[in-house]
Interface confidence: medium
Amino acid sequence: LQDPCSNCPAGTFCDNNRNQICSPCPPNSFSSAGGQRTCDICRQCKGVFRTRKECSSTSNAECDCTPGFHCLGAGCSMCEQDCKQGQELTKKGCKDCCFGTFNDQKRGICRPWTNCSLDGKSVLVNGTKERDVVCGPSPADLSPGASSVTPPAPAREPGHSPQ
């Protein structure tokens, strides 16, 4: 015999108290798959969290963070304060990137500058705390008599991660 609950679509639950009728999920709850015997409680985006996507009968709410904070963890399980570009967040607060590293966002860690020589290229623009180095043509390409080299386009300003 087929389980009658298998006919209950997402957004409903199989109500054992009502002869296994498919009942709509109550307010502030959802079921994202069919055949559910209960609906799950919607996530509430409170405090430093804000609602990115409202809960519906078939999908949970999604949160991000209020201004000045950004998400951490799967599904934005935590919010932490923004730092400035050129910094990273440590246990002692936001700290400037060490020489040789950069961070072009208000979140995340400082990363080492690109080592242009590993690709046989030269440094065209020096790196800063906020920006990676820009690698140029290889030193051989710049030797006298070499064919002219079209300078690379300016590096695109990187966008911030979604907040």
């Epitope: 985006c45 201004p67 304060q81 730092c83 208000k106």
Partner: antibody
Framework: QVQLQESGPGLVKPSETLSLTCTVS????????VHWVRQPPGKGLEWLGV???????DYNPSLKSRVTISKDTSKNQFSLKLSSVTAADTAVYYC????????????WGQGTLVTVSS | DIQMTQSPSSLSASVGDRVTVTCRAS??????VAWYQQKPGKAPKALIY???YRDSGVPSRFSGSGSGTDFTLTISSVQPEDFATYYC?????????FGGGTKLEIK
Amino acid sequence: QVQLQESGPGLVKPSETLSLTCTVSGFSLISYGVHWVRQPPGKGLEWLGVIWSGGSTDYNPSLKSRVTISKDTSKNQFSLKLSSVTAADTAVYYCARNPLTATVMDYWGQGTLVTVSS
Amino acid sequence: DIQMTQSPSSLSASVGDRVTVTCRASQNVGTNVAWYQQKPGKAPKALIYSASYRDSGVPSRFSGSGSGTDFTLTISSVQPEDFATYYCQQYNSYPLTFGGGTKLEIK
């Protein structure tokens, strides 16, 4: 306990720059942001901007070209500068701490009245 | 900018009355609303954040509710020290904005 205290000149001439200092105690500057809010006499509250623990700033776009917020961690001080002031900038100016729980203000200074007049 | 419209702008009440102040946002702000109390000549004091969470030390007679665009601050039994002006504030997006205030006066 947590304390914030605003200080600065009570009278500023039109077209000059208003400069205020907020001296704080009782909490760590590496963990908390500080907002500046003003209140013209007999009117409501207006948010000016915030400086976060790492030094990043966010400003009210209506004032963005005129306002600068900075901090000196070694002195436990925050500063507000508002350039090209007019009589409309006459107000009580408050600094207030941002908690770790939301983008709000949980502790406020007592406020300082700044009058713009020649 | 998100406009926060408070009503009424003033109201009179007696000690022991139940009082409700409302705040309407011009667009959905989730539950990212705070309430402040301000007495004459004093700085504002935080009462509620996240629409319904009382700040530490705030008496239980103060409660907040609402989500989306409509929010309320309720004082279940007004005490003499509650006569003040109350402001709502949204922090869902920049710029942070306040309501125009509601002045609670003694009847």
